[in-house]
Amino acid sequence: PKQTLPKPIIRAESTYMVPKEKQATLCCQGSYGAVEYQLHFEGSLFAVERPKPPERINGVKFHIPDMNSRKAGRYSCIYRVGELWSERSDLLDLVVTEMYDTPTLSVHPGPEVTSGEKVTFYCRLDTATSMFLLLKEGRSRDVQRSYGKVQAEFPMGPVTTAHRGSYRCFGSYNNYAWSFPSEPVKLLVTGDIENTSLAPTDPTFPDSWDTCLLTRETGLQKDLALWDHTAQNLLR
């Protein structure tokens, strides 16, 4: 069987939701010593980066300027050490936002609720769209989808303080082209005695996994890597 290197990790820097005409940055984190990284879009080669010097950095950044609907879709990356290629990374969905119009978001019974009440978000957008998306700030990976002609509903079940936070919705013209975001709706949940101390409000900074953690190798890391390599050989 053909030998391959472990798959790299692909991430979007700051967010996978990129406003049209803005720059998207994707990171591919592979291995020290990788001489080439390839970015693939919808299965085809999209860009190539060669780190300098390859042995001192464990990944690269791919800059995608002037984001538009043609560049929105599924990305993956691979890397090469010598003649050996890695497995393909997981797929990353890159979305273009700020297309066309702005939806409105409403919440029933209202933005201030008590624990145990059932809440429904309603997203409305008059221009032709069939899919709507609801996102909670600080939880942008947890996208809820709903369908409707001009509006869609997002029932939330009995709420707890874990539901507190800011919500926005988008209309979607396809999976990767979204509208402008709605104005945020801040949901306040009170009276959850059992959970209050355990459920702080969600952070308002971007999702922690939407950051590129590319590191330059230090002398110490090199010594550790060499020690690890020697230890592995001894074990063999």
Epitope: T104, S106, P109, G110, S115, G116, K118, Q151, G157
Partner: antibody, heavy 115, light 107 residues
Framework: QVQLQQPGAELVKPGASVKLSCKAS????????MHWVKQRPGQGLEWIGM????????KYNEKFKSKATLTVDKSSSTAYMQLSSLTSEDSAVYFC????????WGQGTLVTVSA | DIQMTQSPSSLSASLGERVSLTCRAS??????LNWLQQEPDGTIKRLIY???SLDSGVPKRFSGSRSGSDYSLTISSLESEDFVDYYC?????????FGGGTKLEIK
């Protein structure tokens, strides 16, 4: 204080339409849902639908989808419900109720459908 | 649609008596339940929201509670103005639905 003003009565002919009004005061009209509720003489209450004045989101009881149309005029803080193709079954008191949890109620408009 | 079964449909009681009205929900509604009072002239007023929260200006003799799918309105000591109609209302799942009502009469 919060007030929802509705006309006392409307007399309409079978087959005609009527547009009921509900003028809100004492709160931020655009921030809260407005519901409409039907009560037939000596009967219980039935929810017709609701509208959010700010977003224009409407939600109807399927039973009333072809009967009622909800609209708002933000400039006058007034909600409207148009009832079409009226029959004797539509003779009832119609209430508007402000806030998602039905906190504030109008006095109701008695609609009588009669030739 | 969620059915709200309200009982009793009518109740005779005396001044100062403690009474409880009940609504049973056919599906889970969480705490999304109101109790409303309707005067003989048709005026409707909300007494309780979110199962047990008392509206401002409503006398403390009114209280709301829940046990499973049963929701109760209790009046601890009846006064003359309490002999009117009462309705429960669920706002958990659209269409929002009302109980059939309870007519509270003086004995």
């Amino acid at each position: 204080q919060v007030q929802l003003q509705q006309p006392g009565a409307e007399l309409v002919k079978p087959g005609a339409s009527v547009k009921l009004s509900c003028k809100a005061s004492g709160y931020t009209f655009t921030s809260y849902w407005m519901h409409w509720v039907k009560q037939r003489p000596g009967q219980g209450l039935e929810w017709i639908g609701m509208i959010h004045p700010n977003s224009g989101v409407t939600k109807y009881n399927e039973k009333f989808k072809s009967k009622a149309t909800l609209t708002v005029d933000k400039s006058s803080s007034t909600a409207y419900m148009q009832l079409s193709s009226l029959t004797s079954e539509d003779s009832a008191v119609y209430f508007c109720a402000g806030d998602g949890r039905f906190a504030y109620w109008g006095q109701g408009t008695l609609v009588t459908v009669s030739a | 649609d969620i059915q709200m079964t309200q009982s009793p449909s009518s109740l005779s009681a005396s001044l100062g008596e403690r009474v409880s009205l009940t609504c049973r929900a056919s599906q889970d509604i969480g705490s999304s339940l109101n109790w409303l009072q309707q005067e003989p002239d048709g005026t409707i007023k909300r007494l309780i929201y979110a199962t047990s929260s008392l509206d401002s200006g409503v006398p403390k003799r009114f209280s709301g509670s829940r046990s499973g799918s049963d929701y109760s309105l209790t009046i601890s000591s009846l006064e003359s103005e309490d002999f009117v109609d009462y309705y429960c209302l669920q706002y958990a799942s659209s269409p929002w639905t009302f109980g059939g009502g309870t007519k509270l009469e003086i004995k």
